[in-house]
Interface confidence: low
């Protein structure tokens, strides 16, 4: 039928930067490129029905269903979802095509279903059908990788029992400390499950799939390095595999390595050794201690000894359940307006935590850094000197932890005033909390020095949203001050601010701000 309009249906996926929920025809988000949904004429249907390709959406994702109509003249439209009519506002693009949009913010089960769009143009009426479903991610998991010895080979296999099957990669680094950060040129990545080169300084295995990325580091004792001041500690849960690597370099091959658990040699089948020549014809030996599935009695001090190096130990602790150890008492800080300051939380946790910093309902990324003493630390410096409540939240598979911080910024008060027929009120948010004075300006006191003490009510500091403190003072109007100018002043150790109010009979009240340092 040549009267039929040319219809294009597209799906726009949005990168969410909005926490609101609802349906709208505006564009509140950053968009990715549109995906064509086809929109084919549905055969054997009464009337003209176009059907878009099925749309699968992740939970909480935001999308726009959009129809572009290449038809002459004006169009009117109506969306119907679950028997409810929804507002529809067509507009025209630069090519003069009619554009109709349905924005779904933060996809939930209740928003899944059939969306019908009825369009009426000057030539004809037609219906467009969209089917929106939530992507089935119930099967998805991402588990931290673990190591196994490859059968009959001196090699490690990295396994992550995740769904969808993850891409596994080894992350290798041969220098130390900061230079082994993920994007450093010293870091080499190998996208394979089996690793034969086991002599590197730092060896990690990472698994990634649609859910993200998880990594496990091969725990290593290096006999050529000065031992840490505190004994290194390794936590594992019952049933997990234990892998410790002992590494030593010597001028020749005339040395050997052994593992002991609580002064008893490890049994055959729980260790294997490898050796290779390093630079300057020195010899590297590595000795792995491993237990395929740990039990409580595998807890203890594992000591690696060498005939040519001082011994070093690690404490292996087997736990039934994961944990997060940190002090959860809330902490209050007061700082100057330009003072450099970071919140910090020191914790010990197993398995590794996922964490966020939150302020004013906004979440910020959380970085954690391992310390030499087995503790980790997370710092947050991006507070931009905004006073209020900051929340650190951490969780792993077995435990949750929350810690509250209050940040107060020392600053001179700033006064806001409002008045009604019966009273005048002043508000201030300076810190430390200000004290108040009220003064009357009259012929006798042109400089407003006559203090008012009666009818003044100082309200106890009132916490604003997200922890910012506000103090207020109210003056009840009396005949003695009606028609006069009065001045309210807030003062603290950093200065004073005042505002002058004309106490008229009811009507608009002019305010004169008056800052005194």
């Amino acid at each position: 039928n040549q009267d039929l309009p040319v219809i294009k249906c597209v799906l726009i996926n949005h990168k969410n930067n909005d926490s609101s929920v609802g349906k709208s025809s505006s564009y509140p988000m950053v968009s990715e490129s549109p995906e064509d949904l086809g929109c084919a004429l549905r055969p054997q249907s009464s009337g003209t029905v176009y059907e878009a390709a099925a749309v699968e959406v992740d939970v909480s994702a935001s999308i726009t269903l959009q129809v572009l109509v290449d038809a002459p003249g004006n169009i009117s439209c109506l969306w119907v979802f679950k028997h409810s009519s929804l507002n529809c506002q067509p507009h025209f693009d630069l090519q003069n095509r009619g554009v109709v949009s349905m924005v779904i913010l933060k996809m939930t089960e209740t928003q899944a279903g059939e969306y019908l769009l009825f369009i009426q143009s000057e030539a004809t009426n037609y219906t467009i059908l969209f089917t929106v479903s939530i992507r089935n991610t119930l099967l998805y998991t991402l588990r931290r990788p673990y190591f196994r010895k490859m059968e009959n080979q001196d090699a490690l296999v990295c396994i992550s029992e995740s769904v969808p099957e993850p891409i596994v990669e080894w992350v290798l680094c041969d220098s130390q400390g900061e230079s082994c950060k993920e994007e450093s040129p010293a870091v080499v990545k190998k996208e394979e499950k089996v690793l034969h080169e086991l002599f590197g300084m730092d060896i990690r295995c990472c698994a990634r799939n649609e859910l993200g990325r998880e990594c496990t580091r091969l725990f290593t004792i290096d006999l050529n390095q000065t031992p840490q001041t505190t004994l290194p500690q390794l936590f594992l849960k019952v049933g997990e595999p234990l892998w410790i690597r002992c590494k030593a370099v010597h001028v020749n091959h005339g040395f050997g390595l052994t593992w002991e658990l609580e002064n008893k040699a490890l049994e055959e089948g729980n260790y294997f050794e490898m050796s290779t020549y390093s630079t300057n014809r020195t010899m590297i030996r590595i000795l792995f201690a491993f237990v395929s599935s740990v039990a409580r009695n595998d807890t203890g001090y594992y000591t690696c000894s060498s005939s040519k190096h001082p011994s070093q130990s690690a404490l292996v602790t087997i736990v039934e359940k994961g944990f997060i150890n940190a002090t959860n008492s809330s902490e209050d800080y007061e700082i100057d307006q330009y003072e450099e300051f970071c919140f910090s939380v020191r914790f010990k946790a197993y398995p590794q935590i996922r964490c966020t910093w939150t302020f004013s309902r906004k979440s910020f990324p959380c970085e954690q850094k391992g310390l030499d003493n087995g503790y980790s630390i997370s710092k947050f410096c991006n507070h931009k000197h905004q006073p209020g409540e900051y929340i650190f939240h951490a969780e792993n598979d077995d435990a949750q932890f929350t810690k509250m911080f209050t940040l107060n910024i020392r600053r001179k008060p700033q006064v806001l005033a409002e008045a009604s027929a019966s009273q005048a009120s002043c508000f201030s948010d300076g810190y430390p909390l200000p004290s108040w004075t009220w003064k009357k300006c009259s012929d006798k006191s042109p400089n407003c020095t006559e203090e008012i003490t009666e009818g003044v009510w100082n309200r106890k500091a009132n916490r604003k949203v997200f922890g910012q403190w506000v103090s207020s003072s109210t003056l009840n109007m009396s005949e003695a001050i009606k028609g006069f100018l009065v001045k309210c002043c807030a003062y603290n150790s950093l200065g004073t601010s005042c505002e002058t109010i004309l106490l008229n009979s009811p009507g608009p009240f002019p305010f004169i701000q008056d800052n005194i340092s």
Epitope: N13, E35, D36, L37, G38, A53, A54, E56, R135, N136, L138, L139, Y140, T141, I159, E161, V163, P164, E165, E210
Partner: antibody, heavy 119, light 112 residues
Framework: QVQLVQSGAEVKKPGASVKVSCKAS????????MHWVRQAPGQGLEWMGI????????VYAQTFQGRVTMTRDTSTSTVYMELSSLRSEDTAVYYC????????????WGQGTMVTVSS | DIVMTQSPLSLPVTPGEPASISCRSS???????????LDWYLQKPGQSPQLLIY???NRASGVPDRFSGSGSGTDFTLKISRVEAEDVGVYYC?????????FGQGTRLEIK
């Protein structure tokens, strides 16, 4: 070596149920999805559903929803597919296939189980 | 559901000659992770299907290098550089982007 061994051929009456088994060996059973695919005589391949042996979650094709049940027994590394309310058009060879990931890539297939539905 | 369309449905080839099979999907099979979720399978007479190519262009282990897969989005091709007698059977493409996973109708390759 990695293999999937299925149960033998079945002849069923319309309205009855059939349960086909698929025993996995040579790999970690819980690390891979298992899919079921059928093929009617002289026809193409039709995907029926998927089971995650780790946890037992399932997704079925709409066509079979309500009639198919996929289960697993991790102690014997076996997956089962039960199809109820059989009709003559269910006559087909039923295959189990291991998925490398969740999204297809069936790298290992069972030998197939012929199910005949006839009165 | 995503519809998969193969062509040709029958492909007579002389041994040693190249062969090419086309597969078209009703919507793009390109995932946001950069992978095209399209597989190719060969079902030899009287046998179970076997995986040839996964994720559009990756040869499965043990598959001869005369088989190659290419394409992206909605258009995909399986090429056999030199057909051998053992390559006869029905070739299927399958989309693994979204459930229900769907197969093409199949292309029967036969020796001339």
């Amino acid at each position: 070596q990695v293999q999937l061994v299925q149960s033998g051929a079945e002849v069923k009456k319309p309205g009855a149920s059939v349960k086909v088994s698929c025993k996995a060996s040579g790999y970690t059973f819980t690390s891979y999805y298992m899919h079921w695919v059928r093929q009617a005589p002289g026809q193409g391949l039709e995907w029926m559903g998927i089971i995650n042996p780790s946890g037992g979650s399932t997704v079925y094709a709409q066509t079979f929803q309500g009639r198919v049940t996929m289960t697993r027994d991790t102690s014997t590394s076996t997956v089962y597919m039960e199809l109820s309310s059989l009709r003559s058009e269910d006559t087909a060879v039923y295959y189990c296939a291991r998925g490398i990931g969740s999204k297809g890539a069936f790298d290992i297939w069972g030998q197939g189980t012929m199910v005949t539905v006839s009165s | 559901d995503i519809v998969m369309t193969q062509s040709p449905l029958s492909l007579p080839v002389t041994p040693g000659e190249p062969a090419s099979i086309s597969c078209r999907s009703s919507q793009s099979l390109l995932h946001s992770n950069g992978y095209n979720y399209l597989d190719w399978y060969l079902q030899k007479p009287g046998q179970s299907p076997q995986l040839l190519i996964y994720l559009g262009s990756n040869r499965a282990s043990g598959v001869p290098d005369r088989f190659s897969g290419s394409g992206s989005g909605t258009d995909f091709t399986l090429k056999i550089s030199r057909v051998e007698a053992e390559d006869v059977g029905v070739y299927y493409c399958m989309q693994g982007l979204q459930t229900p996973y769907t197969f093409g109708q199949g292309t029967r390759l036969e020796i001339k």
